[in-house]
């Protein structure tokens, strides 16, 4: 969450027993009652809020899907971190899924790159060192990758 | 009687300033969030600005630096001070009682900023 | 900021008609949506607050639905009053997000 156009810069130390609102907000952890007054918590493992706010609610904890693992899990103050499982990767324009990583190397390039769960093998032209990007090759041109990345 | 009446407005030049009324009766502000909205003529609402209860305010992007919101509790009334005005403020500004959850219940009946040379 | 998108920007209709207009809000602000009716002259009046809850002295043919990121409004028998404008604004998150209103609905006379 972005807090924007906020005014009072000082915020007070976040305290364990907070009930009322400082300077109009609430701190990480809680959000604002519908009258304004008081500062209700979050409820662990459902929802956070990481800012501070005036949001009248929690935001919803992020569920890991299937072909994800949870590298955190949600807290009243940060959401759940979920990361591809390996031998998949989570491109930058395509945030909503996990793809199975390229096995190998179009022939005639080499892998300099290995699968991460950001990013797929980066595969460069031996002569030029030229990067390739792109969909994966067809098998019979497919250069096998090392024993140590997985397999789609 | 609820109500909230504006005052204040009128003609100003470019790079002037004026500062906006708005008197209370009927309740105490001092219990409530308060906020400012602006209406260009043949336009749409705009929200200028809000203070808290606890008289933090805060400001649309465009609002900062040049508008503040403050509040007399003691005299009910709220204000809006506007520095370096331009041909775009030119507006009818609203005041109303900001209730949270429950949204903008009560409104002014506006004053009008015309900024012109 | 949120930003809310509403549509249509016009619409033009019959006395009696069924009328829905349209919010979207940029991301989730659960049930906090108040919907406002104005005239020409006049500030705007309060119709709708909590996505579908009727403020106080308003006509049971206005009625509200939605909740996340996507509303309604509907008016199921449009009355010759209701010629006017009609916005959206969020309530939650005000000073975290602002309150940036939608940018009407103007319901004219066919």
């Known amino acids: 969450i972005t807090q924007q156009d906020l005014a009072p810069q000082q915020r007070a130390a976040p305290q364990q027993k907070r009930s009322s609102p400082s300077e109009g907000l609430c701190p990480p952890g809680h959000h604002i009652s519908e009258d304004g007054r008081d500062c209700i918590s979050c409820k662990y493992g459902q929802d956070y809020s990481t800012h501070w706010n005036d949001l009248l609610f929690c935001l919803r904890c992020t569920r890991c899907d299937s072909g994800e693992v949870e590298l955190s899990p949600c807290t009243t103050t940060r959401n759940t971190v979920c990361q591809c499982e390996e031998g998949t990767f989570r491109e930058e324009d395509s945030p909503e899924m996990c793809r199975k990583c390229r096995t190998g190397c179009p022939r005639g390039m080499v892998k300099v790159g290995d699968c991460t769960p950001w990013s797929d093998i980066e595969c460069v032209h031996k002569e030029s060192g030229t990067k390739h990007s792109g969909e994966a090759p067809a098998v019979e041109e497919t250069v096998t990758s090392s024993p140590g990345t997985p397999a789609s | 009687q609820v109500q909230l009446v504006e005052s204040g407005g009128g003609l100003v030049q470019p790079g002037g300033s004026l500062r906006l009324s708005c008197s209370a009766s009927?309740?105490?502000?001092?219990?409530?969030?308060m906020i400012w909205v602006r209406q260009a003529p043949g336009k749409g609402l705009e929200y200028v600005g809000f203070i808290t209860s606890d008289s933090s305010a805060y400001y649309a992007s465009w609002a900062k630096g040049r508008f503040t919101i403050s509040r007399d509790n003691s005299k009910n009334t709220l204000y809006l001070q506007m520095n370096s005005l331009r041909a775009e403020d030119t507006a009818v500004y609203y005041c109303a009682r900001y209730t949270y959850s429950d949204g903008t219940d009560l409104w002014g009946q506006g004053t009008l900023v015309t900024v012109s040379s | 900021d949120i930003q809310m998108t509403q549509s249509p920007s016009s619409l033009s209709a019959s006395v009696g008609d069924r009328v829905t207009i349209t919010c979207r809000a940029s991301q989730s602000i659960s049930t906090y949506l108040s919907w406002y009716q104005q005239k020409p002259g006049q500030p705007p009046k309060r119709l709708i607050y909590?996505?579908?809850t009727l403020a106080s002295g308003v006509p049971s043919r206005f009625s509200g639905s939605g909740s996340g990121t996507d509303f309604t409004l509907t008016i199921s028998s449009l009355q010759p009053e209701d010629f006017a404008t009609y916005y959206c604004?969020?309530?939650?998150?005000?000073?975290?997000?602002?309150?940036?209103f939608g940018g009407g609905t103007k319901v004219e006379i066919k």
């Open positions: 009927g309740f105490s502000i001092s219990r409530y969030a």
């Open positions: 909590k996505a579908s």
């Open positions: 604004q969020p309530n939650s998150g005000i000073a975290t997000y602002g309150a940036a």
